[in-house]
């Protein structure tokens, strides 16, 4: 029964599995982008580095009306351990350019995979 | 239905200056963040600047830092991009743009040609 019951209601998800996820939703709108992602909306391009996860989550809230990104508005936020809302930016985001979110998805989405085999998963 | 409406474009030779304008109706303008952006022939869209709500914060693309200013009159939903020191390289169709909304609430933009 114990088992049973950890079956039915599992612990919080690796980190390891959270990132492959991200990873495989970042993959998913790239592929899949016919029209220009988000309509070619700008947003502040981050520094892929230390708090990483929140200032990608700081730019990419401000984008409303783009269903295509809010799956991974919702991941990232599991990956920041603060609440980040709309128009919030952190001493670490430093605001020098915008670029496409066509390009942030792609930028982010190479970062990620090189974490990834380099098995930096948090 | 918000609408962004761009003037002020034209031909200048190199060194000279623009004032380029942006009215805005259809949404409260005082509330949001705005860009310019630009597209020069063949090439993709660029961000120029941005201005925060109060307009209080400016933010500039390192190829027009120190030589364009941005701002915006919010008692008449204005947005401005005064353009001075003017390069060939700044030849494009400028667009004012209400920010993260994407080219669907973009204006139709104004045309800068710098040449001499």
């Known amino acids: 029964l114990t088992c049973l019951g950890g079956f039915a209601s599992p612990g919080p998800v690796p980190p390891s599995t959270a990132l492959r996820e991200l990873i495989e939703e970042l993959v998913n709108i790239t592929q899949n982008q016919k029209a220009p992602l988000c309509n070619g909306s700008m947003v502040w391009s981050i520094n892929l580095t230390a708090g990483m996860y929140c200032a990608a989550l700081e730019s990419l809230i401000n984008v409303s009306g783009c269903s295509a990104i809010e799956k991974t508005q919702r991941m990232l936020s599991g990956f920041c351990p603060h609440k980040v809302s709309a128009g919030q930016f952190s001493s670490l985001h430093v605001r020098d350019t915008k670029i496409e979110v066509a390009q942030f998805v792609k930028d982010l989405l190479l970062h990620l995979k090189k974490l990834f085999r380099e098995g930096q998963f948090n | 239905e918000v609408q962004l409406l761009e003037s002020g474009g034209g031909l200048v030779q190199p060194g000279g200056s623009l004032r380029l304008s942006c009215a805005a109706s259809?949404?409260?303008?005082?509330?949001?963040?705005m860009d310019w952006v630009r597209q020069a022939p063949g090439k993709g869209r660029e961000w120029v600047s941005s201005?925060?709500?109060?307009?209080?914060?400016?933010w500039y693309a390192d190829s027009v830092k120190g030589r364009f200013t941005i701002s915006r009159d919010n008692s008449k939903n204005t947005l401005y991009l005064q353009m001075n020191s003017l390069r060939a390289e700044d030849t494009a169709v400028y667009y004012c743009?209400?920010?993260?909304?994407?080219?669907?609430?973009w204006g139709q933009g104004t045309l800068v040609t710098v040449s001499s």
């Open positions: 743009a209400k920010a993260y909304t994407g080219f669907g609430y």
């Open positions: 259809g949404f409260t303008f005082r509330d949001y963040e």
């Open positions: 201005i925060g709500p109060s307009g209080s914060e400016t």
